[in-house]
């Protein structure tokens, strides 16, 4: 019962985590304009992995997709790759874990096979979570570096009269969503791995017991019961479901209305 609960909870936690990773990847607020010097701005900038946006006081938001691959910073490309790998692994992990759930019966699937699939999905969730955390952390590090670089030369005077204020960017909501989602996926993966241990039946050898009956002697000797944990040589070849995630660059979005000033 505890094993089923652990496995089920691990699945749900991972499902929430992967949904969060997908949400974070799609969000536009990976970096937002730092408002420390100007808390109320008439023009507000924010950027995502796929496009950058400008929100005006008028309520209009204009977003422009990054229509180049080669012109983008290598770090941004790396973050994109990490997030996509995280999503793909997570999606495959979810598919595998659905079939591995103890509460779902599929034909005459042995517990050993379920244990094997549970471990596989658990490892996938752990790697998926780590990919998301790594991606978000790389982006955060990039922001911190750029923030201090732009702070160093924030005001460039033109003859001492005109000031050009450089736009600084700080952490956006997507970073926090990504960190939490990655953490949840990781926790879910660990729970699946723990559940796997409980699912795998222990190797049990019963000692032979002799019963001496009057008249004739009969010996009941149950054979040594040996269940495969799924790691031995007698594993059945199961095809692990393969899924893929495909991303497309965002289409140019026309200015849309926003519901705040």
């Amino acid at each position: 019962m505890a094993v089923t609960a652990c496995q089920g909870l691990g699945f749900v936690v991972s499902l929430i985590g992967i949904a969060g990773i997908i949400a974070a990847t799609c969000m536009d607020q990976w970096s937002t304009q730092d408002l420390y010097n100007n808390p109320v701005t008439a023009v507000f900038n924010y950027q995502g992995l796929w496009r950058s946006c400008v929100r005006e006081s008028s309520g209009f938001t204009e977003c422009r997709g990054y229509f180049t691959l080669l012109g983008l910073p290598a770090m941004l490309q790396a973050v994109r790759a990490l997030m996509i790998v995280g999503i793909v692994l997570g999606a495959i992990g979810l598919l595998v874990s659905i079939f591995a759930l103890k509460c779902i019966r599929i034909g005459s699937m042995e517990d050993s096979a379920k244990a094997n699939m549970t471990l596989t999905s658990g490892i996938m969730f752990i790697v998926s979570g780590l990919c998301a955390i790594a991606g978000v952390s790389v982006f955060a590090n990039m922001l911190v570096t750029n923030f201090w670089m732009s702070t160093a030369n924030m005001y460039t005077g033109m003859g001492g009269m005109v000031q050009t204020v450089q736009t600084r960017y700080t952490f956006g909501a997507a970073l926090f969503v990504g960190w939490v989602a990655g953490g949840l996926t990781l926790i879910g993966g660990v729970m699946m791995c723990i559940a796997c241990r409980g699912l795998a039946p222990e190797e049990t050898n019963y000692k032979a017991v002799s019963y001496h009956a009057s008249g004739h002697s009969v010996a009941y000797k149950p054979g040594g019961f040996k269940a495969s944990t799924g790691f031995g040589s007698n594993t059945k070849n199961k095809k692990i479901y393969d899924g893929g995630a495909r991303t497309e660059d965002e289409v140019q979005s026309y200015p849309s209305k926003h519901d705040y000033v």
Epitope: Q33, N38, V40, T41, A42, V43, N45, Q47, S52, C53, V54, E56, S57, S58, G59, F60, E62, R64, V162, Q163, T164, V165, Q166, T167, P255, K257, D259, Y260, V261
Partner: antibody, heavy 118, light 113 residues
């Protein structure tokens, strides 16, 4: 056709308050930010503040903070500006203006003249 | 606050001639996010509310004659009327739309010579 219809001219005593209205028609009232601009006799334009009719969010020019209060009534598609503790220097024409792309004010009301005798 | 300085204060131009009004801001109005300059030009005739001519420094509002054009970037901007018509006699204002408080220039009075 987009129209911003402002209330009539007002003459108020010093220390009193006045509430100027701006009724919008011909467009989605909650979809555009409304601005208020002051023009003293023979003077230039001065931005008072803005209000987002969708959520009531406001931004004021510090100079008019405490002097002007911006509100909206979504049901009647009307924006209001209340000026408190009136003084002679508050005598001016007050315009409401709809904000569009580029934060530009594309449609303006005809203006409401507020007179505060000294 | 961003200070908008217009020059000249007044300008007399003959019909059909070119009129140029300058506007200088104390801070850059160029937004790095979309590479647009948040500067707007208005025309105001006596007894009338202002009328939008140009936004984003160079984008002409629909219905505005193409003799009106805006140019410039950062801190220096120009409104040009290529061939002055009698109905163009008015006061012209530039406005900072980039940073609160939104600020206007003092205005340039355009008259017929």
């Amino acid at each position: 056709e987009v129209q911003l219809q402002q209330s009539g001219a007002e003459v108020k005593k010093p220390g009193a308050s006045v509430k100027v209205s701006c009724k919008a028609s011909g467009y989605s009232f909650t979809g555009y930010t409304m601005n208020w601009v002051k023009q003293a006799p023979g003077q230039g334009l001065e931005w008072i503040g803005l209000i987002n009719p969708y959520n009531g969010g406001t931004s004021y020019n510090q100079k008019f903070q405490g002097k002007a209060t911006l509100t909206v009534d979504k049901s009647s598609s009307t924006a209001y500006m209340e000026l408190s503790r009136l003084r002679s220097e508050d005598s001016a024409v007050y315009y409401c203006a709809r904000m569009n792309y580029g934060n530009a004010m594309d449609y303006w009301g005809a203006g409401t003249t507020v007179t505060v005798p000294s | 606050d961003i200070v908008m300085t217009q020059s000249p204060d007044s300008l007399a131009v003959s019909l059909g001639e070119r009129a140029t009004i300058n506007c200088k801001s104390s801070q850059s109005l160029l937004n790095s996010g979309n590479q647009k300059n948040y500067l707007t030009w208005y025309q105001q005739k006596p007894g009338q509310p202002p009328k939008l001519l140009i936004y984003w420094a160079s984008t002409r509002e629909s219905g505005v004659p193409d003799r009106f054009s805006g140019s410039g970037s950062g801190t220096d901007f120009t409104l040009t009327i290529s061939s002055l018509q009698a109905e163009d006699v008015a006061v012209y204002y530039c406005q900072n739309d980039y940073s609160y408080p939104l600020t206007f220039g003092a205005g340039t009075k355009l008259e017929l010579k």
